[in-house]
Interface confidence: medium
């Protein structure tokens, strides 16, 4: 007789999860010198460890804490990029501007972008049927916890001037909810951080509105102001140029506004 | 409005201390970064340091550092500025200014108050 | 440190004319999208007064007269035209990094 699963109202975890963490993993270290000594196995065993035979409604920070540990880099606190809802554009930017970083460029966002996961409460069973979703099932499932944890991390850990890819074409193009309004902006530390840049990418050609005036965007400035960090807006109107002369700054068009 | 009404300047002997006090009104003084400014006679402005809202983060020029001390008091609305072994090339007006710079509207100089060191 | 270092020390322009301030960071003192570069004009017996923050951007009340540009290391101010009450002297300072810096400053006349 089948065992009673519990259907949750998300996907399940992602199909051939555990070979998919130690691939990427292997091939993280392998592109990255700094990261060389890191052991691919224990990482997999502490990733393991947070969510498996654990309530999937009932994951903690804590429990992501071996993983953090193992998992610990430096990447530069004053070259990072962090975005709302426009991962595409943030990646391929990073991928240009190699100096700069998104948390998918670390070695644990790296590991976990794109993947879902979940376990059972009781059993060492990876849950590839459903896992909880953050709005209709529990917000302390284990996607959701580790974006959290390793957010707040990397929020932590920057300084200077901050920069943010923000989608302009999106109703609330600020939005309180998104991990970045919820948990890396009250993360941002005031004594690190002088600035931090928003660039609102334009979705339309002809869209030639300033969308720094957006009230999302006011209230973003609000919040931050109060958290004594200096904020700054800046529109991409053609982010496809804006791409170009980051490849090619030299390119006698991109000293005309982008 | 916002005001910044420096104060406590004065003849110093050179090797002695001194303490100048800012305070601020019409804004919410214990969300700012606060800095000293100073300028010699005749001279251009050097920054001296700051201070964070919450007294956690200090930052100073070079050739004040371990000489000058600016802390803050945010119940009192005041900035300090505790200068220690003065010498002659302190001599100087000394501004308590608010240079918040990001989005405009938000940068304020006091008047100034004078130091002079001589013997 | 960053240096700022400012040049004429000194100007002369004709009313209604065209003046210009040059101001040379030592090092970049802009990211990708912003310069931390901005402009004080003080007159005598007076505070500074911002004019332009982040290189370009006019501060509000000051008079459209009064522009900025430049990026990475080379900054200006231009006032154009010059009228009388912009007699004083002009400063560029940096914020892009700790210690922040002064320009020595640049004594605007009329001839």
């Known amino acids: 007789v089948p065992r009673w699963r519990q259907q949750w109202s998300g996907p399940g975890t992602t199909k051939r999860f555990p070979e998919t963490v130690l691939a990427r993993c292997v091939k993280y270290t392998e592109i990255h010198p700094e990261m060389r000594h890191v052991d691919c196995q224990s990482v997999w065993d502490a990733f393991k460890g947070a969510f498996i035979s654990k309530h999937p409604c009932n994951i903690t920070e804590e429990d992501y804490q071996p993983l953090m540990k193992l998992g610990t880099q430096t990447v530069p606190c004053n070259k990072i990029l962090l975005w709302s809802r426009i991962k595409d554009l943030a990646h391929q930017f990073t991928q240009v501007q190699r100096d700069m970083f998104t948390l998918e460029d670390t070695l644990l966002g790296y590991l976990a972008d794109d993947l879902t996961w979940c376990g059972e409460f009781n059993t060492s069973k990876i849950n590839y049927q459903s896992c909880p979703d953050w709005r209709k099932d529990c917000s302390n499932n284990p996607v959701s916890v580790f974006w959290k944890t390793v957010s707040r991390r990397f929020a932590e850990a920057a300084c200077d001037v901050v920069h943010v890819m923000l989608n302009g074409s999106r109703s609330k193009i600020f939005d309180k909810n998104s991990t970045f309004g919820s948990v890396e902006v009250h993360n941002l530390q005031p004594e690190k951080v002088q600035t931090l840049e928003a660039w609102v990418i334009h979705g339309g050609r002809e869209d030639s509105r300033d969308l720094c005036q957006d009230p999302t965007i006011k209230e973003l400035e609000s919040i931050i102001s109060k958290r004594n960090i200096q904020f700054s807006c800046k529109n991409i109107y053609r982010p496809d140029k804006f791409l170009q002369c980051v490849k090619n700054p030299e390119d006698s068009s991109c000293t005309s506004e982008i | 409005q916002v005001q910044l009404l420096e104060s406590g300047g004065g003849l110093v002997q050179p090797g002695g201390s001194l303490k100048l006090s800012c305070v601020a009104s019409g804004f919410d003084f214990s969300l700012y970064w606060m800095n000293w400014v100073r300028q010699a006679p005749g001279k251009g402005l050097e920054w001296i340091g700051k201070?964070?809202?919450?007294?956690?983060?200090?930052n100073y020029t070079p050739s004040v550092k371990d000489k000058f001390f600016i802390s803050r008091d945010n119940a009192k609305n005041t900035l300090y500025l505790q200068m220690t072994k003065v010498r002659s090339e302190d001599t100087a007006l000394y501004y308590c200014?608010?240079?918040?710079?990001?989005?405009?509207?938000?940068?304020?100089w006091g008047q100034g108050t004078t130091l002079t060191v001589s013997s | 440190e960053i240096v700022m270092t400012q040049s004429p020390a000194s100007l002369s322009a004709s009313l209604g004319q065209r003046a210009t301030i040059s101001c040379r960071a030592s090092?970049?003192?802009?990211?990708?999208?912003?310069?931390?570069v901005h402009w004080y004009q003080q007159k005598s017996g007076q505070p500074p007064k911002l004019l332009i923050y982040?290189?370009?951007n006019l501060e509000s009340g000051v008079p459209a007269r009064f522009s900025g540009s430049g990026s990475g290391t080379d900054f200006t101010l231009t006032i154009h035209p010059v009228e009388s009450e912009d007699v004083a002297t002009y400063y560029c300072?940096?914020?892009?990094?700790?210690?922040?810096?002064f320009g020595s400053g640049t004594k605007l006349e009329i001839k």
């Open positions: 090092n970049s003192v802009s990211t990708s999208a912003f310069s931390y």
């Open positions: 300072h940096h914020s892009r990094e700790v210690p922040f810096t």
């Open positions: 982040l290189a370009s």
């Open positions: 201070i964070s809202p919450d007294s956690s983060s200090l």
């Open positions: 200014a608010r240079l918040w710079i990001a989005t405009g509207g938000y940068n304020y």
